[in-house]
Structure formats: C-alpha cells, structure tokens
C-alpha cells in the first residue's frame, strides 16, 4: 500500500525554539516515521533537518539547527515505513518573520506602596532577537488580588516601578514583550503575585521639582516631618533600557548628600547635556524612607526654561502685561526655540484670593480690576509639548496700583 504524505504542517517559532507539528494522513497505518529536509534560498540541494529524522510522533524540534533567521527557508516532509511517501513541501518562510516573542521572565520586589518589576527576555542571549534585544518594550496588566480590577501599563522598560499602591496588599501582574519595530507582540508571562510590605515609618519625599537660578540647579521637594536629612541620586535616563548593564548605577550629587533642608543647590556643570532621572530619600538617623518617585530631568529644557520677564502697563480697570524673553546672568535674553504657554497669577495685595490666566500670546490683558488698588502679578512658562511637559519656576511677584477711574483709554 502506498504511504500518503503527511499534511497540514505547522511551524511554530517562539524565541529560539523551532517546533514542527503535522497531521498523519493515514491513522490506520502503524509504525510510521517521519523525516524532514530543508533548503536554503538559492540552493538546489535539500539537506536532512537534524532533530527531525525518523520521528515516530507528529512533532519535532529543530532548534539546534543554526539558521540565519533573516533568510528564507523551505521544508519538506515524508512518511516512511518499508517504503516512503512522496514529499510534501511546506510553504517557504523566514524564521524572523514567523517568530513569536516568548513570555518574559519577571522578578518582583515589594516596598510598602510600590512594586519594583525586573523584566528580562525569556530566552537569554537569543539568536532570534540578537539585533533587537534593546528594542524590546514591555506592557503589563496589574490587579489587586482581592478585587481583580485590572490596570494596563504600556511601553515600559525592563526595570519598572509602580507607585501609589496600598501597604500589606497582594498585587498580581503579568507581562508581555513587544518589538514595535517589527510589529511583534509577545505572549504573557505566567501571573506573578507579591504582597506589599507594612507601611514604612518614614514616607518618601514628594513633589520633586528642579529649577534654575543663576548657574545653579535648585532641587526642591516636600516632606512630612522636620529634622530629617536627605540624599539625592541621579541616573542617565537611557540606562533604564539597559538595567543589566554595569553602568546602571545611581550616583550621588555631592552637594545633595545629607542635606538638612528640603532643597539642595548644585552647579549646572554637574550634568552634561542630556536626560537624567533624579530621586530623593529621607532619613532620621535611625530609619530611612524608600526612594521617592523618580523624576525626569532634561538639562536642555531645564536650563533654558527660565521664568518670563514682563512689564505691566496699569489702567483703572485692567493691566496690560507684556511678556519678554527671560534674562540669563549677564542680562542677555534667552532664545526659546519651542512654543511656550504662559500662566499668569494675580491677586489683590490685601487678599490671598488668586486668579489665574493661561495665555499663548505675549501680550495679555488682566481685566475686571478695581481702580486705585494694588494688585500683584507673577508668571511662569510651560512647554506646550506634552512629552516634555516642563514648567519654569514663577517669576518674582510685581505689584502695581491701578489708575483712578475713567482711564481705561
């Protein structure tokens, strides 16, 4: 009896694992084995596919074959008993195109109100992703074990911290990888759960802000308690993509080690041009807080996003405010080459009730003022680019008295 060729061959590639599955074409025939050959592009001859010769099952693994994953390959299969079936040719394919990203490895560390997630590719030193290893981004789904309400977090790197969690609470999450450059989305990791720790005695510092004064950066933060010491650390932001690299080291800012105030001042030349992450930690001598949330700090924007300079022309019922380029030390104006939006705060000198105007224009009218009344004005600039989302500090307040009635011309 002639053996029939196997049918419906499926090629599954996950990371560096190459699996073939097929259907027996004749279930009634026993003791049949199956063998594969492969052919590379531009070659006439067929080569025996190691790992897939004389297979008794309907699945084989040819991961040991060292293929160029970007090169097209063709496979063929036949059944064998005393005689052999005709060859069945599988549609040619390029391994890289066909490959799926496997589940990443996930390691969790708990803090009281945060979880640190360490993610690494499921296959270490993968051949398939050798040229794309640093292009992996990850997304995750996290939920409270007790509620099951899921939150999705997209586009994270291989070391990520989730903040604003509840102490002593079990959270579960799963992670998948993506190679956006190749339009590949991976499969989820198994679910990992971890319980956050008991609430720390000392909370981390909050609301960290960087501003520029003269040739210095001023770093400010808020803290709940008095009589504390603080330390500040920084990291090159791009190293977040490379947490396994030996250069991933948080560094000290010397002028911000063991400071006793909720701010520190350090020279601008501490940082070269670039994007950095900053974090702050509090200590009372006995206990230490967890690190604050990390803030992104772009020297190019920070250095030049100075508070606006403005002049006020006073009328009886309004102020005309003319915003000019901010001045750097030496009284030279700074050229801002990105669009800005201005936030103007004004209030009656005798009251704390502030009013706010947001304007793109550099000449602004503050309406509905009372005559012969002292009003104070301060302003700050914001970048309009959502990604940068930077703000200058407020300018010093300028106070002016409105004119007597009927001088609105």
């Amino acid at each position: 009896k002639n053996l029939k060729s196997p049918q419906k061959v499926e090629v599954d590639i996950i990371d560096d694992n190459f699996i073939l599955r097929w259907n027996r074409s004749d279930e009634s025939v026993g003791n049949v084995t199956f063998s594969f050959d492969y052919q590379k592009t531009g070659m006439d001859n067929w080569i025996k596919l190691s790992g897939c010769q004389n297979i008794t099952s309907t699945k084989c693994n040819f991961s040991s074959l060292k293929l160029n994953v970007y090169e097209e390959i063709k496979l063929r299969i036949r059944a064998e008993k005393e005689n052999t079936s005709s060859w069945y040719e599988v549609d040619s394919f390029t391994p890289f195109r066909k490959a799926q990203i496997g589940p990443p490895e996930v390691h969790l560390e708990a803090e009281d109100k945060a979880i640190v997630i360490h993610i690494s590719p499921g296959t270490k030193d993968s051949v398939m992703w050798a040229l794309d290893g640093l292009s992996f981004t990850y997304s995750l789904v996290i939920w409270k074990n007790s509620s099951g309400v899921e939150e999705r977090i997209e586009n994270i790197y291989s070391r990520h911290k989730i903040y604003k969690l509840s102490p002593e609470t079990t959270y579960c999450l799963k992670v998948k990888a993506a190679l956006l450059t190749s339009w590949k989305i991976g499969v989820y990791s198994p679910v990992h759960c971890i319980k956050t720790t008991v609430e720390n005695e000392l909370p981390p510092p909050e609301n960290i802000e960087v501003s520029v004064q003269n040739q210095n950066y001023v770093l400010k933060w808020d803290y709940t308690y008095a009589n504390m010491t603080f330390q500040v650390q920084w990291l090159h932001a791009f190293l977040k993509r490379n947490p396994g690299n030996h250069l991933y080291k948080w560094k000290q800012i010397p002028d911000c080690e063991n400071v006793k105030t909720t701010q520190c001042v350090f020279p601008q030349n501490v940082f070269q041009k670039g994007i950095y992450l900053l974090r702050v930690q509090a200590s009372d001598g006995n206990n230490t807080s967890f690190w604050s949330e990390e803030i992104k700090f772009d020297t190019e924007i920070q250095a030049f996003l100075l508070p606006p300079v403005f002049n006020i022309r006073s009328l009886s019922d309004s102020f005309h405010i003319y915003i000019g380029a901010p001045k750097q030390s030496g009284n030279t104006p700074v050229i801002q080459d990105y669009p800005l939006i201005y936030e103007i705060i004004f209030w009656e000198n005798t009251s704390n009730a502030e009013r706010k105007i947001i304007e793109k224009k550099t000449d602004v009218t503050v309406p509905n003022l009372k005559p012969l009344t002292v009003y104070c004005v301060k302003a700050r600039a914001h970048t309009m680019d959502e990604k940068l989302n930077k703000s200058s500090v407020f300018s010093d307040a300028v106070c002016e008295k409105t004119k007597p009635g009927n001088t609105s011309k």
Epitope: A130, N245, H246, L247, K249, K251, Q252
Partner: antibody, heavy 117, light 108 residues
Framework: EVQLVQSGAEVKKPGESLKISCKGS????????IAWVRQMPGKGLESMGI????????RYSPSFQGQVTISADKSITTAYLQWSSLKASDTAMYYC??????????WGRGTLVTVSS | EIVLTQSPGTLSLSPGERATLSCRAS???????FAWYQQKPGQAPRLLIY???SRATGIPDRLSGSGSGTDFTLTITRLEPEDFAVYYC?????????FGQGTRLEIK
C-alpha cells in the same frame, strides 16, 4: 581637572607579590568605574576588570579572573591592582582608566611591570 | 565574551586621504556602549568616539563613527600627520569589556 596618577615602574622576580595603584582626582571618585587595562610588549589592549568604588562592585574579565585582585579605597580615592605570585608573562604596561557611559574617557600614564629572574 | 575583529590589520595611506577602519563584533552590541581609541607609541590610549558616533571632547570633526549591531566603522576624512597611530575599537555593553586587536594606520 580630572587626573589619574599611577604608581611608578616595578621590577620583580617571578613568585613575588605586587600591588600597583591609581589615584583619581578632580571628579567624584565614587561615581565612576575604574578599569584596569593590560598591554603586553608590542601587543594590543586587554581589559582586565573594573571596580565601582561607590559600592565596591568588581567585575573581572574571564581571562583575568583568579589571576589578579582589584580593589579600591574610596577614602583616599585610590584603586589597586595586585598579584600574589607574579609570572614572567605578567610583564606589561598596566593602565587605569575612568569608565562611564562615554567609555574610558581619562587614562593614567601607565605602570610598567617587569618580571624577570 | 564578545570578540571584536578589526580590519584591516594595517592601513597605508597618505596625508589628505580618507581612512575607513572596520570593527566586527561576534554578537550584537548596543551602539550606546561602543567606542574607538587612538594610541601613539609610548602614550596611553585616547578616547575618540563613544556611543558609536559621538565625538569625545576636543576630537576634530574629520573623525566620525558609525554602525550598529555587529558592524562599526571609524572614518577619518582628510588624514593629517598626527592621525597616523594605532586605533582600537571597544565594546562595554558587557562588563567583560573587550577591545579589538587594533588597526595600524601608517604613512604610505
């Protein structure tokens, strides 16, 4: 000004021990790795290992693991490279270099070690 | 460990000519952690290029670096007498940092 000042040339006999030094100044010593690089006569550069004085993290290159010991004393901003038993094949110029994301951006002038019976 | 292979071993050119030095890695290296150095006889090496393409302080724009993955190139557009030296590539993607064996650039 960033400077790495290395200790002077050494002439030793096989089997003897040796410790050479590299003192960093003009920068925050604990914020940068220090690398040790060997250059045998007429040959190329070989990275032996690196140390991060901030937390004493040490990484040896595979071919130098167990052959040398790298250490640092951050209180005096100095890194060290030592041998417990020198061989003639250790004869070389040894450089220290400051290492960060810009590679090895500052180098010492080198310490020439000669091992001969 | 990652092996870096430089080619050619020796390059003989005249001042004013263009030099192209190649470095191939045995496995993919992040371009963020790739550098080129110059060494002259009796001197310590000097950093030229880091991050595959960024010039170090004081390096003239006649020198440029390019490449990614496993193939990197150092180009010197108009050779000056002071450019004749040995050039090394380096990867620091892994903490087992490695150098290429060097390319000697000599005057023809």
């Amino acid at each position: 000004e960033v400077q790495l000042v290395q200790s002077g040339a050494e002439v030793k006999k096989p089997g003897e021990s040796l410790k050479i030094s590299c003192k960093g100044s003009g920068y925050i010593f604990t914020n940068y790795w220090i690398a040790w690089v060997r250059q045998m006569p007429g040959k190329g550069l070989e990275s032996m290992g690196i140390i991060y004085p901030g937390d004493s993290d040490i990484r040896y290159s595979p071919s130098f693991q167990g052959q040398v010991t790298i250490s640092a004393d951050k209180s005096i901003t100095t890194a060290y490279l030592q041998w417990s038993s020198l061989k003639a094949s250790d004869t070389a110029m040894y450089y220290c270099a400051r290492h960060d994301i810009e590679g090895f951006d500052y180098w010492g002038r080198g310490t020439l070690v000669t091992v001969s019976s | 460990e990652i092996v870096l292979t430089q080619s050619p071993g020796t390059l003989s050119l005249s001042p004013g000519e263009r030099a192209t030095l190649s470095c191939r890695a045995s496995q993919s290296v992040s371009s963020s952690f790739f550098a080129w150095y110059q060494q002259k006889p009796g001197q310590a090496p000097r950093l030229l290029i880091y991050g595959a393409s960024s010039r170090a302080t004081g390096i003239p724009d006649r020198l440029s670096g390019s490449g990614s993955g496993t193939d990197f190139t150092l180009t010197i557009t108009r050779l000056e007498p002071e450019d004749f030296a040995v050039y090394y590539c380096q990867q620091y993607d892994s903490s087992a940092i490695t150098f290429g064996q060097g390319t000697r650039l000599e005057i023809k």
